[in-house]
Structure formats: structure tokens, C-alpha cells
């Protein structure tokens, strides 16, 4: 059979190869397509409801006036010539639309080096077959799941045109000390061949580094963190961001109602007072970030305090020195 | 929403002429064939005629060829049928009917409009 | 031309019956037939297109099937509303043939 494509919504003619060129004629069209269960026979005589997909025209071709999804299939023409020859024509018909150019949509202006951000989603409308979506960093492909690019696809079906939507949402991890303007495109890949890409435009969002934070110091004094009953603990909180973060405190686990303040002072210590402290430095551009724990206890006479404090990661339910 | 309005219908006399409109809204008139369907008083249905969306193809059954023409004004959103040499027969309501072809045949109906044919 | 042969031509029913109504195509016409309802006095309405695909706004009560070039309109439990003259229509080929219609009337 000889293959045919041909877009959606235009005309076609297909040749009924060996028929006299005007009537009478002695020719059958038969067609096997999404119209059809098995086979449909259209004469030059005919006319009729099939007109508006499939007619024959006077030279014998068959002329479809506006092809559609439906009209995919198997072609065939068996014609006699005046001599009493038989030719037979066979043609396989595949349809295709291409989409509006795609677009990049909900884009991001600025992306974080070191972690996962979503670049953007690429929407195609309108294609048939559905073809495919690719992203390209600085012109070169993007290879899903390598190098910290990850891509989330989606492809729906008009429930009247059964023409495709294909989404593509990027995610990427942008290399620390990398390009800080990256350009990134997004292209649809037509499903039949011998049609080039459509691109979209490209965006630039910007890289921020983020500084790496310096630990939140917790200093205990008395040093280690064990007085004696009706004592003073000092905690200080020291953090060498700039500006000066707020400075909130726990204790077990749980927030002190109190004002922000990098001192913490617990005058005449009693036994309510023992637990393990940390403080919390809220950052307006990185968020919390939490203190090692220290655990405060008293010291009855006669029993030797410990020489240290607690020591624990960032957050509580650590060791305590008792 | 979609609509379909015949008018036109009436008393006529045997052998004498009448022209039925149908003025369409609420969709995209010349995507679609039409189709005039009749019904006479009591019986079944009948196909009476259908035109392609441009007009340039009409269909009749042979009860009517040669003597009734349906026609359309895609400008004016409207659909015509012109019946000569009427007979007694020919006595039915009439509808205009959206579609006709295999991709949408008579989704839609009018109201129907009654011609009369009698002396 | 192609014959549409309807049957039964009138039934009685009750409210909450299965009903069943038969079109029987002269030669083969592929999916194109649909079903019509129709009351006195007023236009026919479309129930069933391409043999057996609801259309809008159609209760699912209704429905179609076919096999070779028998078509098939089944009501599973007949409403009030229901009462009417039922028709099928024939539209792969011209001329576009109607069955005979199918009065269902209450017991």
C-alpha cells in the first residue's frame, strides 16, 4: 500500500489508478477506516451521507473533502478499464496536526543551587499524533533523571477533536558555583516523521547560591551546665549572620514563652528549671535553624558536676549530662 | 443554545407552491448539512431532503425530486425548502433537522411547521 | 433502498418494566442508526446515536446496542415520561429511512 499523510482538516485526493478519466466507469471504492466496521463500498454513483467525508468524483479519484481523525486507514480501488483491465490502487492514510507553538508556563524567575526546583511546565495543545516534549539547558537535551533533572509528564485527549494536550513540568538542581543564568527551551517533537520540532522560547531564571550558614552556637555558663540549687545558668545564643537573626528558646523540646533574645538568663535555679535548653535563630531568608541541646541540672552538695555540657546534633531528645 | 424555527407552513391547493424557511441560531450554521423531515397527520417519519454545508449538493428522495428544492443562506443563518406541484399527500408537518450526513444526522428538531394541502 | 423494519409496532407497559424495541436493517449500515422519542404534538428527540452512544442530556436508563443489522433500543425500567412513540432511523445511505415506530402505551 502506499503510504499517505495528510493534515487534518484539509482536503484529499486519492488517484483510482487505470479508470477512464469521465463516465460511464466501472470502478469501486472501498474503505477501512474509524468509520467504518470492516468495509465500506462508495461508488462513482453514489451520494449520499458519506458525501461529507468520502465522495467519488467524476474521474473516478475519491476526494475527501476535510480529513479527520476518523479517516485513517485502508484506501483501496478496483477499477476496469474499456479494454476489460482490471487495476487495483491501495493506499494507507495517516493524519496528523501540529500544534500551536508550545509554550513554557508558571516559569520561575530564580532558582537555588543545591536543591530540587521546579524550572517550569511546557504545555503543547492541539498536536496529533501526540508526539513528544524535550527540554534543552543552553541548547543541548536534558536527560530525565541524570544530573538532577527529573520531569513530570501528562498527556490528555480532547474528548471532541481527539486532538492531544502534552504537559511537561521540569525539575532541576542547579550545580553550586554553575551558571547563574541558565537558558532552558522546551520543544514538541511531531509523532510522524518528516516534521521539524517547534520550540519555545527561552527563559533565564537566575541561580541564587545561598551563603552556607555558620552553627548556631549555644555557650552555657557555668560551664557545663550543673549548679548548685538557688545559682545562676547563663545561655548565650551566638550567631555570625548578618543582620542578627531572632533568637527564641526551648526547653525539652518545647518553645519558652518569652521575648527573642540571644541570652537566656535562669536566676535561682530550682528544680522546675532542670532540662535540656536550645535556641532557635530564625532566619528571613533561610528559615530555623536549631542549637546543639544542653541539658541544665543541679547539683546536691557533695556530688561532683560534670566537666561539660550535653553535646547533641541540631535538635532535641539528645544525651543529657545529669 | 440551539434553535431551529420553521415558518411558512399553511393552506394550499393541489398543484399550487409553498416555501418553508428555518432560521437556526445558536451554533455555526454552515458546519453543518440540514435535513427537512415530514410527518402526515397519524403516520411515521419520512426524509424529505438534505443539503451539504456549503449548498453546493442537495439529496431527494424520489417521492419529492423534481418538485420540491431545499436550499440554504449561510449569511442569514437559514434553511429553505420550495415545494411545487403539491399534492394531497404531501399534506404533513414539516421539521427542519440539524445534520443528515454520518457524522451528525438530526441531533437537533424544530418545531415543525403543518402545510395543508387540499382544495 | 434500504428497509427499516420496527417491531413491535405498539406495547404495553407498565412503570418499572424492561422494554425492549427492535430494528431490523434490509442490508448492512454499519453504526448508523439512531433512536428517536417522540409525543404527541411535538418533535421528534434524539436518544441513541451511531447505534449505540447516549446523547446529551438522555437518562441512562436508555440505551443501544446492534449486532450485524439488528439494532436495539432498550428502556430498563420504564418511567411516566416514558410513554411515547419511539423510532429508529437508518443514515448510511440515501434514501435516510425511518422504521415504522414503536408506540409504547401504559397497561
Known amino acids: 500500500a502506499q503510504n499517505i499523510t495528510a493534515r487534518i482538516g484539509e482536503p484529499l485526493v486519492l488517484k483510482c489508478k487505470g479508470a477512464p478519466k469521465k463516465p460511464p466507469q466501472r470502478l469501486e471504492w472501498k474503505l477501512n477506516t474509524g468509520r467504518t466496521e470492516a468495509w465500506k463500498v462508495l461508488s462513482p454513483q453514489g451520494g449520499g451521507p458519506w458525501d461529507s467525508v468520502a465522495r467519488v468524483l467524476p474521474n473516478g479519484s475519491l476526494f475527501l473533502p476535510a480529513v479527520g481523525i476518523q479517516d485513517e486507514g485502508i484506501f483501496r480501488c478496483q477499477a476496469m478499464n474499456r479494454n476489460g483491465k482490471e487495476t487495483k490502487s491501495n493506499y494507507r492514510v495517516r493524519v496528523y496536526q501540529i500544534p500551536g507553538k508550545p509554550e513554557i508556563v508558571d516559569s520561575a524567575s530564580e532558582l537555588t543551587a543545591g536543591v530540587p526546583n521546579k524550572v517550569g511546565t511546557c504545555v503543547s495543545e492541539g498536536s496529533y499524533p501526540a508526539g513528544t516534549l524535550s527540554w534543552h539547558l543552553d541548547g543541548k537535551p536534558l536527560v530525565p533523571n541524570e544530573k538532577g533533572v527529573s520531569v513530570k509528564e501528562q498527556t490528555r485527549r480532547h474528548p471532541e477533536t481527539g486532538l492531544f494536550t502534552l504537559q511537561s513540568e521540569l525539575m532541576v538542581t542547579p550545580a553550586r558555583g554553575g551558571d547563574p543564568r541558565p537558558t532552558f527551551s522546551c520543544s514538541f517533537s511531531p509523532g510522524l516523521p518528516r516534521h521539524r520540532a517547534l520550540r519555545t522560547a527561552p527563559i533565564q531564571p537566575r541561580v541564587w547560591e545561598p551563603v552556607p550558614l555558620e552553627e548556631v552556637q549555644l555557650v552555657v555558663e557555668p560551664e557545663g551546665g550543673a549548679v548548685a540549687p538557688g545559682g545562676t545558668v547563663t545561655l548565650t545564643c551566638e550567631v555570625p549572620a548578618q543582620p542578627s537573626p531572632q533568637i527564641h528558646w526551648m526547653k525539652d523540646g518545647v518553645p519558652l514563652p518569652l521575648p527573642p533574645s540571644p541570652v537566656l538568663i535562669l536566676p535561682e535555679i530550682g528544680p522546675q528549671d532542670q532540662g535540656t535548653y536550645s535556641c532557635v535563630a530564625t532566619h528571613s531568608s533561610h528559615g530555623p535553624q536549631e542549637s546543639r541541646a544542653v541539658s541544665i541540672s543541679i547539683i546536691e552538695p557533695g556530688e561532683e558536676g560534670p566537666t561539660a555540657g550535653s553535646v547533641g546534633g541540631s535538635g532535641l531528645g539528645t544525651l543529657a549530662l545529669a | 443554545e440551539v434553535q431551529l424555527v420553521e415558518s411558512g407552513g399553511g393552506l394550499v391547493q393541489p398543484g399550487g407552491s409553498l416555501r418553508l424557511s428555518c432560521a437556526a441560531s445558536?451554533?455555526?450554521?454552515?458546519?453543518?448539512?440540514m435535513t427537512w423531515v415530514r410527518q402526515a397527520p397519524g403516520k411515521g417519519l419520512e426524509w424529505v431532503a438534505s443539503i451539504d454545508n456549503s449548498g453546493d449538493n442537495t439529496y431527494y428522495p424520489d417521492s419529492v425530486k423534481d418538485r420540491f428544492t431545499i436550499s440554504r443562506d449561510n449569511a442569514k443563518n437559514s434553511l429553505y425548502l420550495q415545494m411545487n406541484s403539491l399534492r394531497a399527500e404531501d399534506t404533513a408537518v414539516y421539521y427542519c433537522?440539524?445534520?443528515?450526513?454520518?457524522?451528525?444526522?438530526?441531533?437537533?428538531w424544530g418545531q415543525g411547521t403543518l402545510v395543508t394541502v387540499s382544495s | 433502498d434500504i428497509q427499516m423494519t420496527q417491531s413491535p409496532s405498539s406495547l404495553s407497559a407498565s412503570v418499572g418494566d424492561r422494554v425492549t424495541i427492535t430494528c431490523r436493517a434490509s442490508q448492512d449500515v454499519g453504526i448508523y442508526v439512531n433512536w428517536f422519542q417522540q409525543k404527541p404534538g411535538k418533535a421528534p428527540r434524539r436518544l441513541i446515536y451511531?447505534?449505540?452512544n447516549l446523547a446529551d442530556g438522555v437518562p441512562s436508563r436508555f440505551s443501544g446496542s446492534r449486532s450485524g443489522t439488528d439494532f436495539t433500543l432498550t428502556i430498563s425500567s420504564l418511567q411516566p415520561e416514558d410513554f411515547a412513540t419511539y423510532y429508529c432511523l437508518e443514515f448510511d445511505e440515501h434514501p435516510l429511512t425511518f422504521g415504522g415506530g414503536t408506540k409504547v402505551e401504559i397497561k
Open positions: 445558536g451554533f455555526t450554521f454552515n458546519n453543518y448539512w
Open positions: 433537522a440539524r445534520g443528515g450526513d454520518i457524522k451528525v444526522s438530526l441531533d437537533r
Open positions: 451511531r447505534a449505540t
